[in-house]
Interface confidence: low
């Protein structure tokens, strides 16, 4: 018996071929022996089965000995053994219809769980294997669970349902609501303007919600709210902003914040949260600000950084075109009685310069 797998809502074609390539008498019946369709002269006739309004045949292929049955808008309960009777022979085709649906909204926040449920006919024992857009393979039986969605899970999931060594493929579009980055660090010299950007990893027709940036300055004992804002149909409006620092915010997406000046007292970590309308939970992005200052005071040349830096970062003071260098895995370096010339302060990670500041040391006569 031939087995054909179908998808709920789709169309399936069950083939039946006669040995002689000519138009001949045929019938399609279900397992209860109730006629679904057949041929009467040159006309397609339909029996009283529940498929009568959704079953059809390709009349153009009858004279080639092909007597297929097409079933439209498949339902799980269409799963059955169908019998084609032609030339005094019976051909049986077992149709198994499966449906795969997401249990919840397909727009989910990062960290939320996704459950895909397989609808299957009684008596079947299918297996399901799903592949995420990022190449993650998840397999299961009648349900597949992804406990914690990640941003790379956004996109089209391809799920293969296997039964009786046959397969049927489902495509489900999942949108993971998240920022493009979980965390970002901005490195600035003291006094420079700071730009924070928070691009979203998704697009929605209507995007409404509210957000807030909380900031924990390195020098401060507690965090404080720097800005709160509303989002209405992708338009940003500031609700409240601190006086110090006086942040500015772009009116359009992506969310964009400008800090007029990078100062040591602002160095630290922030957490931007965005609560979307009709969604439980919030989107988060961490942002870090590292500020560098190079100063000369009397006979001491000092370079300092403030903000969250990794212990493996190197801070160096280097005299341009000379070999004189002081390097430390620390947040401050200094040179006593520095030579005259252009000194560079460098913050680097494994040789890659993250931030640099130049300071000119004039000769003292």
């Amino acid at each position: 018996k031939k087995v054909v797998l179908g998808k709920k809502g789709d169309t399936v074609e069950l083939t039946c071929n006669a040995s002689q390539k000519k138009n001949t008498q045929f019938h399609w019946k279900n397992s209860n022996q109730i006629k679904i369709l057949g041929i009467q002269g040159l006309f397609l006739t339909k029996g009283p089965s529940k498929l009568s309004d959704r079953a059809d045949s390709r009349k153009s292929l009858w004279d080639q000995g092909c007597f297929s049955m097409i079933i439209k808008n498949l339902k799980i309960e269409d799963s059955d053994t169908y019998i084609c009777e032609v030339e005094n022979k019976k051909e049986e085709v077992e149709l198994l219809v499966f449906g795969l649906t997401a249990n919840s909204d397909t727009h989910l926040l990062e960290g939320q769980s996704l459950t895909l449920t397989l609808e299957s006919p009684p008596g079947s024992s299918p297996s399901v294997k799903c592949r995420s857009p990022g190449g993650k393979n998840i397999q299961g039986g009648r349900t597949i669970s992804v406990p914690q969605l990640e941003r790379q899970d956004s996109g089209t999931w391809t799920c293969t349902v296997s039964q009786d060594q046959k397969t049927v493929e489902f495509k489900i579009d999942i949108v993971v609501l998240a920022f493009q980055k979980a965390s970002s660090t901005v490195y600035k010299k003291e006094g420079e303007q700071v730009e924070f950007s928070f691009p979203l990893a998704f697009t929605l027709e209507k995007l409404t919600g509210s957000g807030e940036l909380w900031w924990q300055a390195e020098r401060a004992s507690s965090s404080k709210s720097w800005i709160t804002f509303d989002l209405k149909n992708k338009e940003v409006s500031v609700k409240r902003v601190t006086q110090d620092p006086k942040l500015q915010m772009g009116k359009k997406l992506p969310l964009h914040l400008t800090l007029p000046q990078a100062l040591p007292q602002y160095a630290g970590s922030g957490n931007l949260t965005l609560a979307l309308e009709a969604k439980t939970g919030k989107l988060h992005q961490e942002v870090n600000l590292v500020v560098m200052r190079a100063t000369q005071f009397q006979e001491n040349l000092t370079c300092e950084v403030w903000g969250p830096t990794s212990p493996k970062l190197t801070l160096s003071l280097k005299l341009e075109n000379k070999g004189a260098t002081v390097s430390k895995q620390a947040k401050a370096v200094w040179v006593l009685n520095p030579e005259a010339g252009m000194w560079q302060c460098l913050l680097s990670d494994s040789g890659q310069v993250l931030l640099e500041s130049n300071i000119k040391v004039v000769p003292t006569w």
Partner: antibody
Framework: QVQLLESGPGLVKPSETLSLTCTVS????????WSWIRQPAGKGLEWIGR???????NYNPSLKSRVTMSIDTSENQFSLNLSSVTAADTAVYYC??????????????WGQGTTVTVSS | DIQMTQSPSSLSASVGDRVTITCQAS??????LNWYQQKPGKAPKLLIY???TLETGVPSRFSGSGSGTDFTFTISSLQPEDIATYYC?????????FGGGTKVEFK
Amino acid sequence: QVQLLESGPGLVKPSETLSLTCTVSGGSISSYYWSWIRQPAGKGLEWIGRIYISGSTNYNPSLKSRVTMSIDTSENQFSLNLSSVTAADTAVYYCARELERPYYYGMDVWGQGTTVTVSS
Amino acid sequence: DIQMTQSPSSLSASVGDRVTITCQASQDISNYLNWYQQKPGKAPKLLIYNASTLETGVPSRFSGSGSGTDFTFTISSLQPEDIATYYCQQYDNLPLTFGGGTKVEFK
């Protein structure tokens, strides 16, 4: 972990109906097929049939005319009724969970079994 | 229904012996075959599925092979706790059917 326990009369008269219940504890009755298997003394295993959470059933054709299975999700129980019993139905009756995984279909959890004797 | 024929129906072996049981299906069942162990007075326990995959926690001395209609179950070195009856079971088609069993005992 999931445990199964069969219950029902140990003695049934010929021509009467054998009724057994299997109680599922330590887990949900959802998302699995639940089956009945029997084993006459000193003989092999025979699959009687199975039932799904939706109430859909599959029976062994050799017993189909006499078998009825039901499921009670609120009580976490499923049942077997075998009508018109004869001495040939004397056996140890097991309930089991049929677990489905990719490349796997097997009975991974079994009850301890209950002996049913058909005798007048 | 798919008939499952197991042989031998019983065998005697000593500790450390290699024990082999065969199972033949009446039609091609691909790899859809399980092996169960049943100790006296106990319920069966699944040892091998998909003809050759060892269930979690089952000792590696148990193995299975075969595809289509002919299958083999092997105990590489018989242990005292392996004394039991072993059954093959197909899951290619409903109804699920078992072999007649092979009783393994000591010489």
